[in-house]
């Protein structure tokens, strides 16, 4: 399709590097997290820091590139490096409009995200919406 | 200062391929934005042909798509279009342009290419 | 793909007018609010010039008299008061679908 991607933008204080220039920031008002509509790609990207059982968004935006993982509908995470002892980066890609905004699972740090494995897990009914 | 500068054949034959090669002076190509091809035939309107961004993504308009090709040489800091099986339609001022987001903020002078046996 | 048609085709006015040229879009050039239309200046022989971006961003450079408004499919650029080098060729271009398409072009011409 020609329209172009829009996602969720966020970058954690401290954070190095930035995806900024991989899209253009929307303004969305208030009541929805800061967007960036997509430049090269059609595709989202999200990574959260997992510490013991708390998860906490680093970044969120646009891909560079549309490459494996960014045809998925979702934002389904899966482990990539220890940054530190006990911390885990969990990463996913995919390719909706706003579809980094928040996961419905993180995989244990141990596993490698396969479908059945538990991590911090919203409500019944709700996921985990990063506010931003 | 940032420069762009196309250069190129002013003449092509029908059914060859046109070349055209755009050297960017006074910035980086593989730091950051998209680099583009435009072209106006004689007299009327602009229409964009594709980019190829600083980290390598490629668009291409889909009415050119099956005959353009832009790539890019980072060792001269360059961008090329080739534009293949050409006829007298092709006739243009072609421009290579930077993109800042989606929008054209700095251009080349243009070079005319006629298309003519 | 997404056509831009502007009007009037040609705008014949005298240097201190008020220009106001428009450019309607087939479709929506919003998205979440935020509208992808820009302008462009064209002088015989030359390159494009970038005046306005996303509507009514005036480029850095740009005379304030220059202006851009609209959301949605209708947009004008208004030039306050026309100083001499303001006659030229006046091109909207829209870039939230792809392929990026241009209008046909505004001459403001003098009178």
């Known amino acids: 399709p020609p329209n172009r991607r829009t996602c969720v933008f966020f970058e954690a204080p401290g954070v190095q590097g930035s995806t900024k220039t991989l899209g253009e920031l929307l303004d969305t008002g208030p009541e929805l997290p800061r967007a960036i509509r997509c430049l090269y790609s059609r595709c989202c990207f999200g990574i959260w820091n997992l510490t013991q059982d708390r998860a906490q968004v680093e970044m969120q935006g646009c891909r560079d590139s549309d490459e494996p993982g960014c045809e998925s509908l979702h934002c389904d995470p899966s482990p990539r490096a220890h940054p530190s002892p006990g911390s885990t980066l969990f990463t996913c890609s995919c390719g909706t409009d706003f579809c980094n905004a928040n996961y419905s699972h993180l995989p244990p740090p141990g596993s490698p995200g396969t479908p059945g494995s538990q991590g911090p897990q919203a409500a019944p009914g709700e996921s985990i919406w990063m506010a931003l | 200062q940032l420069q762009l500068q196309e250069s190129g054949p002013g003449l092509v034959k029908p059914s060859e391929t046109l070349s055209l090669t755009c050297t960017v002076s006074?910035?980086?190509?593989?730091?950051?934005?998209?680099w583009n091809w435009i072209r106006q035939p004689p007299g009327k309107g602009l229409e964009w042909i594709g980019y190829i961004s600083y980290s390598g993504s490629i668009s291409y308009n889909p009415s050119l798509k099956s005959r353009v090709t832009i790539s890019v040489d980072t060792s001269k800091n360059q961008f090329s279009l080739k534009l293949s099986s050409v006829t007298a339609a092709d006739t243009a001022v072609y421009y290579c342009a930077r993109s800042r987001y989606s929008w054209f903020d700095y251009w080349g002078q243009g070079t005319l290419v006629t298309v003519s046996s | 793909e997404i056509v831009l048609t502007q009007s009037p085709g040609t705008l014949s006015l005298s240097p201190g007018e008020r220009a106001t040229l428009s450019c309607s879009a087939s479709?929506?050039?919003?998205?979440?609010?935020?509208?992808?239309m820009h302008w462009y200046q064209q002088k015989p022989g030359q390159a494009p010039r970038l005046l306005i971006y996303r509507a009514s961003s005036l480029e850095s450079g740009i005379p304030d008299r220059f202006s851009g408004s609209g959301s949605g499919t209708d947009f004008t650029l208004t030039i306050s008061r026309l100083e001499p080098e303001d006659f030229a060729v006046y091109y909207c271009?829209?870039?939230?679908?792809?392929?990026?398409?241009f209008g046909g072009g505004t001459k403001v011409e003098i009178k």
């Open positions: 271009q829209q870039s939230n679908e792809d392929p990026y398409t």
């Open positions: 006074g910035y980086s190509i593989t730091s950051d934005y998209a």
């Open positions: 479709e929506s050039v919003d998205t979440y609010g935020n509208s992808f």
